[in-house]
C-alpha cells in the first residue's frame, strides 16, 4: 500500500494532525525533498555571517561572512578573520610574517621565501613580507657583458685613488 | 535562556563619547570572547572591536583605533565599549556576539539585537 506521504512534494509536509494531507511549510522553514514528515527550521545568518541566499519553502537559507572575514567549513559553518597580507593569523590576532617569510593572501600562514640557490638560480628580485623572492637566471646563464642583478658600485670621487 | 543585551546607545554631538554594554547572561562568560560589530544604514556590517576570554584585544577596524577601547567585567558578565571622539560616520546600530574566540565566529554563537548610535554634526 502506497505511502500517501510519499504523494508531498518539497516546500510541503505530510501533516498527521490532519489527516496526512500535504500542507505547506510553515514561515521559516523548508523541506528540500518530497514525503517529509516535518519542514526544517531555515537557517538564520545572525552577526558576522550575511545571507547570501534567503530561505524559500524548498531551500534552506545560505550565508557568507561579512567583510573583514572569510567562509570555513561546510556550507560557511564558520567566519574567520582576515589579515592584511604580509600577515598570519595567531592564537593572539593577525601577526606580521617573520623575517624570510611571506604571504600574499588575507588567510593562510606565511610561508617561507623561494630559496633560488637550490635550483641553482639567483636572486632577482628580493622577498618582502608580502611577496615571494623572484628567482633570476643562473650566474651560469649570464654571458658576458650581460647585466648582473648586482647594484653598480658607487662612483668613486675624482681624486681618490683605491685603497 | 542565553541572552545577550545591548545598552547605552543615544544620540551625540560629533566629538562627544558613549559607553555601550554588552550584558550575557544563560552562558559561562568567562570563556567566552566578545565582538562588537556594526551596522550603518545602507552599509555592510562591519567588525569594530573584539575582547577575548582572557582580556586581550583585537581590533577589527582602523578607524576606531586610538578612539574605541573595550574592556570586561567578569563579575557583573559585562563587556563595555568605550567610545571618545565619536564621528558622523559611527553612526550605526551596534551589537555583541559571543564567540570563544576573536578570530572565528560559528554559526552557533549567540548574538544580541542592537543599540542604536547617532552621531550629529
Known amino acids: 500500500l502506497q505511502d500517501p506521504c510519499s504523494n508531498c512534494p518539497a516546500g510541503t509536509f505530510c501533516d498527521n494532525n490532519r489527516n496526512q494531507i500535504c500542507s505547506p511549510c510553515p514561515p521559516n522553514s523548508f523541506s528540500s525533498a518530497g514525503g517529509q514528515r516535518t519542514c526544517d527550521i531555515c537557517r538564520q545568518c545572525k552577526g558576522v555571517f550575511r545571507t547570501r541566499k534567503e530561505c524559500s519553502s524548498t531551500s534552506n537559507a545560505e550565508c557568507d561572512c561579512t567583510p573583514g572575514f572569510h567562509c570555513l567549513g561546510a556550507g560557511c559553518s564558520m567566519c574567520e578573520q582576515d589579515c592584511k597580507q604580509g600577515q598570519e593569523l595567531t592564537k593572539k590576532g593577525c601577526k606580521d610574517c617573520c623575517f624570510g617569510t611571506f604571504n600574499d593572501q588575507k588567510r593562510g600562514i606565511c610561508r617561507p621565501w623561494t630559496n633560488c640557490s637550490l635550483d641553482g638560480k639567483s636572486v632577482l628580485v628580493n622577498g618582502t613580507k608580502e611577496r615571494d623572492v623572484v628567482c633570476g637566471p643562473s650566474p651560469a646563464d649570464l654571458s658576458p657583458g650581460a647585466s648582473s642583478v648586482t647594484p653598480p658600485a658607487p662612483a668613486r670621487e675624482p681624486g681618490h685613488s683605491p685603497q | 535562556q542565553v541572552q545577550l543585551q545591548e545598552s547605552g546607545g543615544a544620540l551625540v554631538q560629533a566629538g562627544g563619547s558613549l559607553r555601550l554594554s554588552c550584558a550575557a547572561s544563560?552562558?559561562?562568560?568567562?570563556?567566552?570572547?566578545i565582538g562588537w560589530f556594526r551596522q550603518a544604514p545602507g552599509k555592510e556590517r562591519e567588525g569594530v572591536l573584539c575582547i577575548s576570554s582572557s582580556g586581550g584585544s583585537t581590533y577589527y577596524a582602523d578607524s576606531v583605533k586610538g578612539r574605541f577601547t573595550i574592556s570586561r567585567d567578569n563579575a557583573k558578565n559585562t563587556v563595555y565599549l568605550q567610545m571618545t571622539n565619536l564621528k558622523p560616520e559611527d553612526t550605526a546600530v551596534y551589537l555583541c556576539?559571543?564567540?570563544?574566540?576573536?578570530?572565528?565566529?560559528?554559526?552557533?554563537?549567540?548574538w544580541g539585537q542592537g543599540t542604536q548610535v547617532t552621531v550629529s554634526s
Open positions: 556576539g559571543a564567540p570563544r574566540d576573536c578570530s572565528r565566529y560559528s554559526s552557533d554563537d549567540y
Open positions: 544563560g552562558f559561562t562568560f568567562d570563556d567566552y570572547a
